[in-house]
């Protein structure tokens, strides 16, 4: 660490007096302090003289000597006072700048420390401080103003008591500016605009920042706009916006508007897309396929969405048929709006019923027209099976009837012993009927279909099985021969409820 | 060794604002003096003002209604702006370090900032 | 403020031969607070005398500054050839800091 001669914390002396400040250390060494006249540097080798043979009350203040070769960094202080009677303060600034909630240093440094107990911190023109003001004083640095505040901006003056008056340093300003988070915040609005030619459209973009030092600007296309500025100030904010005003919007003002602000921090921009039109609109799509298939008892949301300008004047969903002419509740209709020109509606259709399948159309209505979209619905269906025993053209035939969607796979199956179902060890024989009579197959309604198997001579200790599957699940039919006649029963577990 | 770096838009529109921020590696910002200068092309070097870290400031008269400095020792930068700018304000900005004694001994590269619409 | 004058405006000289460039000041200046810059084009101005006299470190005997009050100048002993540039002068100690308007020396 440099070492400073005179060996002394502080020096005092009067105006005009020599003043020789050496400073030793083990390489070469730097001297710092306030910028004021007078002073002679010489430097030689490890050492550094700072001298004036005419010491002012400006050459008051803190000089410090390092060595710029010590990697710690080590500094030596003295601080001088030239104590002029007529001259209390030193001031090394007019103008202090600092951010809000720090700590804001008034220098202005007392040339007698004899002078501290008399000093005081006002405003310009003698008024007091503000309400609040939190301040310290060191004869060496000046007034500390903690945590300053925006509203604590203002022009200061050091005061000291010399002979009982009070004697003023000139005027120090104090800028305390907002903590700028960063870029402006931006507002663009609308989001998105349709207008048909020849319509008014407006367009706004506003920014606001703790600062007033930003700059925000509107353009098309990358053409920046000329907009007259509003500016405001509210909720500690500053705010300018611009607002374009379009009469009678033509396709040439179509396209893309950004909202740009910028600050020192960085800049921020949000766009919108402005489309013009020749006419109104109305389109109607959906992300379903519009043919849906549901199994019965489960529930299904039909969506569809709608685009449109101007705003729908209408809409409604409704059942075509066949079944009924039951109408979907409203209350399982609902609508979202995406945004101002597109909307989303669904119908909910819970636990669907028999009598549920069929069309369902969405309608809207706008100055351009209705629009509808219709939905199919068809319901999915486990096979029901009955088995019946006759004769055609005199040949006895087990004849089998399975009605389910979508349309059922028959399998026969003989097997040895009574038993509503057969299991594969009691299988004797396997017939599937890849191309089974369909008896109705109506849109909406089940699909029935009937295969037969002729049967020369029934075996009485035997069973002849239908069975019918789908993608929904499965149904069988046990026919038993019995020498009274012939016996038939579905097995237990298939009880279908609609 | 420290190292200075001017940063900033280099190119503002008349009656803008001129943004500039100074960020020194390398070294404390602490306990000096930092300066701003200027050189429009093919000129001479002018200064502009000068902050200390606690936040004084002084600035040349010829500017100063237009000037305002400000140090965040948090991030060991400075910063100029420099308000209501016209196409005479178009120049290579320096940012240095001032030291008392010893004149301006630490020089960042510059900027060049262009005042046009 | 203090006005700095400097003389001449293009010093035209090869590289071995010896450069004085002068600077004169409107009115004293301290010669604590007198400095003298290089500026290479495309760079920054770099230090190369303070105090009137005391060499900036890394700066090449070779140059060397003198003068006090109002007259000051900058000796350039033996011209290499990266010493072809623009030199400034400058007062440090009375605000305004002011530059000279520069000297440039060229490869005769």
């Known amino acids: 660490i440099p070492v400073i001669e005179p060996s002394v914390p502080e020096l005092v002396v009067k105006p005009g007096a020599t003043v020789t400040l050496r400073c030793v250390g083990n390489g070469s060494v730097e001297w710092d302090g306030p910028p004021s006249p007078h002073w002679t540097l010489y430097s030689d080798g490890s050492s550094s003289i700072l001298s004036t043979n005419n010491a002012t009350f400006q050459n008051t203040g803190t000089y410090r000597c390092t060595e710029p070769g010590d990697p710690l960094g080590g500094s030596a202080a003295i601080h001088l006072y030239v104590k002029d009677p007529a001259r209390p303060w030193n001031v090394l600034a007019q103008e202090v700048v600092v951010f809000e909630d720090q700590d804001a240093l008034l220098p202005c440094l007392l040339t007698d420390p004899v002078l501290e107990a008399g000093v005081s911190l006002v405003r310009v023109r003698g008024r007091p401080l503000m309400r609040h003001t939190n301040y310290s004083f060191s004869p060496w640095h000046g007034f500390t103003i903690h945590r300053a505040k925006f509203i604590q901006s203002q022009d200061y003056q050091c005061s000291a008591l010399m002979g009982g008056r009070k004697v003023m340093s000139i005027s120090i300003r104090l800028k305390v500016q907002k903590v700028i988070p960063g870029p402006p915040a931006l507002t663009l609005v609308p989001a998105e605009l349709v207008r048909i030619r020849g319509e008014a459209a407006q367009i706004v973009c506003s920014a606001s920042s703790v600062d007033v030092n930003f700059d925000v600007f509107l353009q098309h296309n990358n053409t920046k706009l000329a907009i007259p500025q509003q500016s405001d100030f509210h909720n500690n904010r500053y705010q300018k916006v611009l607002t374009l005003n379009l009469d009678q919007v033509d396709f040439q003002h179509a396209g893309n508007y950004s909202c740009v602000a910028s600050n020192v921090q960085g800049k921020h921009s949000t766009s919108m897309f402005f489309r013009v039109v020749e006419s109104a609109y109305l389109n109607l799509s959906s992300e379903q396929n519009l043919i849906q298939e549901v199994t019965v008892g489960e529930g299904l949301n039909l969506k569809v969405m709608v685009e449109a300008y101007p705003g729908l004047q209408g809409f409604n969903w409704t059942y075509l048929g066949p079944f009924s002419d039951h109408q979907p509740e409203p209350k399982l209709a609902n609508a979202t709006t995406k945004d101002t020109y597109r909307h989303t509606f669904t119908l909910s259709l819970p636990r669907l019923k028999p009598s549920e399948a069929g069309r369902y159309s969405f309608l809207a209505r706008n100055p351009g027209g209705w629009r509808a979209l219709t939905f199919e619905l068809t319901l999915r269906y486990p096979p029901e099976v009955s088995v019946i025993w006759t004769f055609i053209n005199g040949s006895g035939t087990l004849l089998c009837a399975a009605s389910g969607y979508p349309q059922p796979n028959v399998t026969w199956l003989q097997c040895s012993g009574h038993t509503d179902r057969c299991d594969e060890a009691q299988v004797l024989q396997v017939w599937d009927d890849p191309y089974p009579e369909v008896l109705s197959q109506e849109p909406f309604h089940k699909v029935t279909v009937q295969s037969l198997l002729t049967v020369e001579t029934l075996e009485h200790n035997q069973t002849y099985e239908c069975r019918a599957h789908n993608s929904v699940g499965s149904g069988s039919w046990a026919f038993i021969p019995i020498s009274a006649g012939a016996h038939t029963h579905p097995p237990d577990e298939f009880l279908f409820t609609p | 060794q420290v190292q200075l770096q001017e940063s900033g838009p280099g190119l503002v529109k008349p009656s803008e604002t001129l943004s500039l921020t100074c960020t020194v590696s390398?070294?404390?910002?602490?306990?000096?003096?930092w300066s701003w200068i200027r050189q429009p092309a093919g000129k001479g070097l002018e200064w502009i003002g000068r902050i200390y870290t606690s936040g004084s400031t002084n600035y040349n008269p010829s500017l100063k209604s237009r000037v305002t400095m400000s140090v965040d020792t948090s991030k060991n930068q400075f910063s100029l702006k420099l308000s209501s700018v016209t196409a005479a304000d178009t120049a290579v900005y320096y940012c240095a370090r001032d030291r008392t004694f010893y004149a301006f001994d630490m020089w960042g590269q510059g900027t060049m900032v262009t005042v046009s619409s | 403020e203090i006005v700095l004058t400097q003389s001449p405006g293009t010093l035209s000289l090869s590289p071995g031969e010896r450069a004085t460039l002068s600077c004169r000041a409107s009115q004293s200046v301290s010669s604590t607070y007198l400095a003298w810059y290089q500026q290479r084009p495309g760079q920054a101005p770099r230090l190369l005398i303070y105090?009137?006299?005391s060499r900036a470190t890394g700066i090449p005997d070779r140059f060397s500054g003198s003068g006090s009050g109002t007259d000051f100048t900058l000796t350039i002993s033996r011209l290499e050839p990266e010493d072809f540039a623009v030199y400034y002068c400058q007062q440090y100690g009375s605000s305004p800091y002011t530059f000279g308007q520069g000297t440039k020396l060229e490869i005769k």
């Open positions: 390398g070294g404390s910002i602490s306990s000096y003096y």
């Open positions: 105090g009137a006299s």
